[in-house]
């Protein structure tokens, strides 16, 4: 029986241009956790793995950081970015638990504040 | 660190039946989908056989299905191929492989030293 | 089943010198996720394989950064920027993305 549950940040903003760690938490459970993937939609953005450590995917190698720990860390935002991002547990002898992050990146306050003012 | 060891291989006559094993360490082996790979005397290497970390699907090459059959232990931490009709094109080294990453499609990091499998009357 | 096709078949290369391996493949090996299915393989005379490259460019751990793959979709490189005599061997590529996992018909490469 699956007991375990995934703690996540839930709905998180960041600005563009800057960085956001991605984190989610396996508990109440004592199963091996024997990867972690991080996709974005239907992109894999990396894979944690026991055995063999971290494997970034080629896409986004200039963009994404192992860690820290199990979590993933996003760099050079951009509005693109937006969106549900999953970590995947596979565990052993549970199975799957999955969670789930919304990202939001926002323009920077920097361009917001310049966005108030119309120059004559 | 990951070692895999097939043991198991021989002569054997044509229509004969051989099983194979394949002792897995340094892993966690019951979380890793598991192959078999042949390659006949020099020649390239073939695909024969797929099994999931939980034994629920098995996948053969054409050239096998029917006459051959993967299975694994995993309390023993042991992959099996058990090999029957046996043909004198079934003569290969034959290789047990891990897959690389957990349920990461079909391809295989790590393996075995091979065993040898000779058909012939 | 998806056919891997590998050129040249035979290479000798000088030490020092680098070497390149093509491997097309007859379908797309780039899966909706974004990674590209392909791996290389080396097996040195007397060897098992050993893995190379995974996910058509990652290295995997231990190899030399020598060694560097490319390529997305049906076309792939194995490069070898300066060729050593530990390199001698047979060079495999290798889809994973579809049952069966197919692979090249072997590259042989040797010093001259």
């Known amino acids: 029986m699956m007991t375990g549950t995934i703690e996540t940040t839930g709905n998180i903003s960041a600005e563009k241009g800057g960085s956001i760690i991605l984190q989610c938490h396996l508990s109440s459970t004592t199963a091996q956790v024997t990867q972690v993937n991080w996709e974005q939609q239907d992109q894999l953005l990396a894979i944690c793995n026991a055995d063999l450590g971290w494997h970034i995917s080629p896409s986004f190698k200039d963009r994404v950081a192992p860690g820290p720990g199990l979590g993933l860390t996003l760099q050079s935002l951009t509005v693109n970015d937006t969106g549900e991002y999953f970590c995947i547990y596979h565990t052993y002898p549970d199975g799957t638990y999955t969670g789930r992050i919304f990202l939001e990146v926002l323009e920077s306050s920097v361009a917001e504040h310049g966005a108030r003012f119309q120059i004559p | 660190q990951v070692q895999l060891v097939e043991s198991g291989g021989g002569l054997v006559q044509p229509g004969g039946s051989l099983r194979l094993s394949c002792a897995a360490s340094g892993f966690t082996f019951s979380s890793y989908g598991m192959h078999w790979v042949r390659q006949a005397p020099g020649k390239g290497l073939e695909w024969v056989a797929f099994i999931r970390y939980d034994g629920s699907n098995k996948y053969y090459a054409d050239s096998v299905k029917g006459r051959f059959t993967i299975s694994r232990d995993n309390s023993k931490n042991t992959l099996y191929l058990q090999m029957n009709s046996l043909r004198a094109e079934d003569t290969a080294v034959y290789y047990c492989?891990?897959?690389?990453?957990?349920?990461?499609?079909?391809?295989?990091?790590?393996w075995g030293q091979g065993t040898t499998v000779t058909v012939s009357s | 089943d998806v056919v891997m096709t590998q050129s040249p078949l035979s290479l000798p290369v000088s030490p020092g010198e680098p070497a390149s391996i093509s491997c097309r493949s007859s379908q797309n090996l780039l899966h909706r996720n974004g990674i590209n299915y392909l791996n290389w393989y080396l097996q040195k005379p007397g060897q098992s394989p050993q893995l190379l490259i995974y996910w058509g460019s990652n290295r995997a751990s231990g190899v030399p950064d020598r060694f560097s793959g490319s390529g997305s979709g049906t076309d792939f490189t194995l490069k070898i920027s300066r060729v050593e005599a530990e390199d001698v061997g047979v060079y495999y590529c290798?889809?994973?993305?579809?049952?069966?996992?197919?692979f090249g018909q072997g590259t042989k490469v040797d010093i001259k």
């Open positions: 290798m889809q994973g993305l579809q049952i069966p996992p197919t």
């Open positions: 492989a891990k897959e690389m990453l957990v349920q990461d499609y079909y391809y295989m990091d790590v």
